[in-house]
Amino acid sequence: LQDPCSNCPAGTFCDNNRNQICSPCPPNSFSSAGGQRTCDICRQCKGVFRTRKECSSTSNAECDCTPGFHCLGAGCSMCEQDCKQGQELTKKGCKDCCFGTFNDQKRGICRPWTNCSLDGKSVLVNGTKERDVVCGPSPADLSPGASSVTPPAPAREPGHSPQ
């Protein structure tokens, strides 16, 4: 015998109090699949969370973070504070990158500068707290009579992964 509840589409629930007829989800709730016996309460984006997508009868609300914070966890379960470029977030707050490291993002930790010599190259532009070293040609290519080197045009550094 077919379960009468299986006919209830997303956005409704199978109401046991009303002879298992399909009732619309009440306000601030949703059901994303058919055949549900209850609707789920919509997520509320409060505090450092802000609403990215409103709740509907068939899908939950989606949150992201207010400016100055970034998402962590599946579905942006947590907001963590941003730091400035040239800093890293420690468990005691934002702190400047140590010499020899950099961070060109507002999140994450400081990364060691590239060691150009490991790839047989020379340093073209020194690193800073916010930017990696730029490696140039190998030292042999810089000998007298070698063709001049045009520094590479600035390009977008690796950025944030979409959450």
Partner: antibody
Framework: QVQLVQSGAEVKKPGASVKVSCKAS????????MHWVRQAPGQGLEWMGW????????NYAQKFQGRVTITRDTSISTAYMELSRLRSDDTAVYYC?????????????WGQGTLVTVSS | SYVLTQPPSVSVAPGETARITCGGD??????VHWYQKKPDQAPVLVVY???YRPSGIPERISGSNSGNTATLTLSRVEAGDEADYYC????????????FGGGTQLIILG
């Protein structure tokens, strides 16, 4: 969807070199650092190095410095890991893995692995 | 210190809770990531930055980190959880940026 597809298995003799490729698709290749990790038979995971595909900047684990070279070809969204002066204990599965956009987080996408066998 | 210490194996019955530890000097000050590795498969990130799950990872997998020990917890374990689990940390040192623990084999009894 993000995919990292690696080159096929290789058999090499001691002293030779091997070059493994990792072709990325489904995202902006230049925007995310690529890492290489290996696992020898019966051993654990071992980090080897990374490359910034945008600048070509690299960093290598001290153990591999002088033997490993990581490069990239942005025109075909491919990273390469070359290991030279191979020894029998370099027999391992080599993986490329993507960093999720900032240093200090976990590696979110991995290639399927490339088995390199070093045998005389 | 750049050594992360894991127990070689942890055994647990189906439905029970498994806890896998990762020890390191002041590891609580670092961000710890955990990977699941099954034979002939690529590693899968199951927890990142101590306690956050990527999309698609079940809520029964969780992580914590304080002092000298980080812990991966798998509650209501299933046969499909049998795998090796590795902790991993990034450092700002130029010589040892990426360090993995030795791995822990999770054995499901019965």
């Amino acid at each position: 969807q993000v995919q990292l597809v690696q080159s096929g298995a290789e058999v090499k003799k001691p002293g030779a070199s091997v070059k493994v490729s990792c072709k990325a698709s489904g995202y902006n290749f230049s925007g995310y650092y690529m890492h290489w990790v290996r696992q020898a038979p019966g051993q654990g995971l071992e980090w080897m190095g990374w490359i910034n595909p945008n600048s070509g900047g690299t960093n290598y684990a001290q153990k591999f410095q002088g033997r490993v070279t990581i490069t990239r070809d942005t025109s075909i969204s491919t990273a390469y890991m070359e290991l030279s002066r191979l020894r029998s204990d370099d027999t391992a599965v080599y993986y490329c893995a993507r960093e999720p956009g900032y240093y200090g987080s976990g590696l979110d996408y991995w290639g399927q692995g490339t088995l390199v066998t070093v045998s005389s | 210190s750049y050594v992360l210490t894991q127990p070689p194996s942890v055994s647990v019955a189906p439905g029970e809770t498994a806890r896998i530890t990762c020890g390191g000097d002041d590891i609580g000050d670092k961000r710890v990531h955990w990977y699941q590795k099954k034979p002939d498969q690529a590693p899968v990130l199951v927890v990142y930055e101590d306690r956050y799950r990527p999309s698609g990872i079940p809520e029964r997998i969780s992580g914590s980190n304080s002092g000298n020990t980080a812990t991966l917890t798998l509650s209501r374990v299933e046969a499909g959880d049998e795998a090796d689990y590795y902790c991993q940390v990034w450092y700002s040192s130029p010589d040892h940026p990426g360090v993995f623990g030795g791995g822990t084999q999770l054995i499901i009894l019965g």
